[in-house]
């Protein structure tokens, strides 16, 4: 087996003239074992858990975790500071606010620390693995006899966020939904003054600042209006 | 039986252009990270551009802002435009994919590529 030499720029000079695909699988050598992906979220750029699924090595393996980022001031080799465990094995590293820099490409490198050649480095554009906290303080506010409008806030620069409104009364079976962009306000026109209405709404990185595709979780939920006689077990269900 | 089969390979002058193709058979690449490597005679293979399936692209630091990685799902295939080649991309150019669970999963490292194509050949003259 031909080795691979790393450089902190991110480009691998690599000879691999021996693939996962050349051999029976009876035949394969521990090095030659694909080691798990490694996902990265960055929660509301306070922190950043970059975290792989140590249960799918063949026997408990303490991997390790190595990262810089490519063409920047900080492209020197950095270890992982503090590791997350599963059952004792490590399964994720957890970076700091100070270690996390947005718009510049992250590298990751998994290694088998036992059989060094047993290695593998992904490339992660970390502006689109942002998550935001769920929106919070969520407000209601009558304009009208029949409209009201949502408020809330996020705890991040709004310019940045997106954000998904969910409303339904105690009649409904299902989530109405409404997309709003950066302005963090929603208008429902016409209320009916005899239903309970209930509100949610979660915020996601997309699309000044970032293409994330996953989602916040959802605030807690808001209600108005009057209780109705007809109780709707998906409204209990949601507050449970 | 996965096949990867890289064409579109020349000889070309310097400050020139080529479009190589990586069409796949026995596989779909929409769930693949794909990766576009080199070799060059007498040096190692190294890593030149990588797709993941979310369509996130990252290339080594010597081309990039001169190839453009695309794929397309519905022809199974991948593409590397190359731009204002120089002598040093001369190399064999082989295609690779790699089976990944995440939309964002971009490897670097050849190890990391389960399928391979034969490659092409670019040859750049001065």
């Known amino acids: 087996l031909n080795t691979t030499i790393l450089t902190p720029n991110g480009n691998e000079d690599a000879t691999t003239d021996f693939f996962l695909t050349s051999m029976p699988t009876d035949s394969l050598s521990v090095s030659t074992l694909p080691l798990p992906e490694v996902q990265c979220f960055v929660f509301n750029v306070e922190y950043m858990n970059c975290t792989w699924n140590s249960s799918s090595e063949p026997q408990p393996t303490n991997l390790t975790l190595h990262y810089w980022y490519k063409n920047s001031d900080n492209d020197k080799v950095q270890k992982c500071s503090h590791y997350l465990f599963s059952e004792e094995i490590t399964s994720g590293c957890q970076l700091q606010k100070k270690e996390i820099h947005l718009y510049q490409t992250f590298v990751v490198q998994l290694q088998d620390p036992r059989e060094p050649r047993r290695q593998a480095t992904q490339m992660l554009k970390l502006q689109n693995l942002v998550i935001p906290w769920a929106p919070e303080n969520l407000t209601l506010r009558k304009l009208s006899e029949s409209q009201l409008e949502l408020n809330w806030n996020n705890r991040f620069l709004n310019h940045c966020l997106e954000h998904l409104v969910q409303y339904r009364t105690d009649w409904d079976h299902s989530w109405t939904e409404q997309s709003v962009d950066y302005r963090h306000k929603f208008s429902l026109p016409s209320v009916d003054g005899q239903k309970r209405y209930t509100f949610r709404v979660r915020s996601r990185f997309n699309p000044l600042c970032g293409s994330a595709q996953h989602w916040s979780e959802w605030s807690h939920p808001i209600h108005w209006g009057s209780n109705s006689s007809k109780e709707n077990p998906f409204l209990f269900a949601l507050e449970a | 039986q996965v096949q990867l089969v890289e064409s579109g390979g020349g000889l070309v002058q310097a400050g020139g252009s080529l479009r190589l193709s990586c069409a796949a058979s026995?596989?779909?690449?929409?769930?693949?990270?794909m990766g576009w490597f080199r070799q060059a005679p007498g040096k190692e293979r190294e890593f030149v551009a990588v797709m993941s399936w979310g369509g996130d692209t990252f290339y080594t630091d010597s081309v990039e802002g001169r190839f453009t990685f695309s794929r397309d799902n519905a022809k199974n295939a991948v593409y590397l435009e190359m731009n204002d080649l120089q002598p040093e991309d001369t190399a064999v150019y082989y295609c690779a994919a790699a089976p990944t669970s995440f939309a964002t999963t971009a490897y670097s490292s050849s190890n990391s590529y389960s399928y391979w194509g034969r490659g092409t050949q670019v040859t750049v003259s001065s």
């Open positions: 026995g596989r779909s690449l929409s769930r693949d990270a």
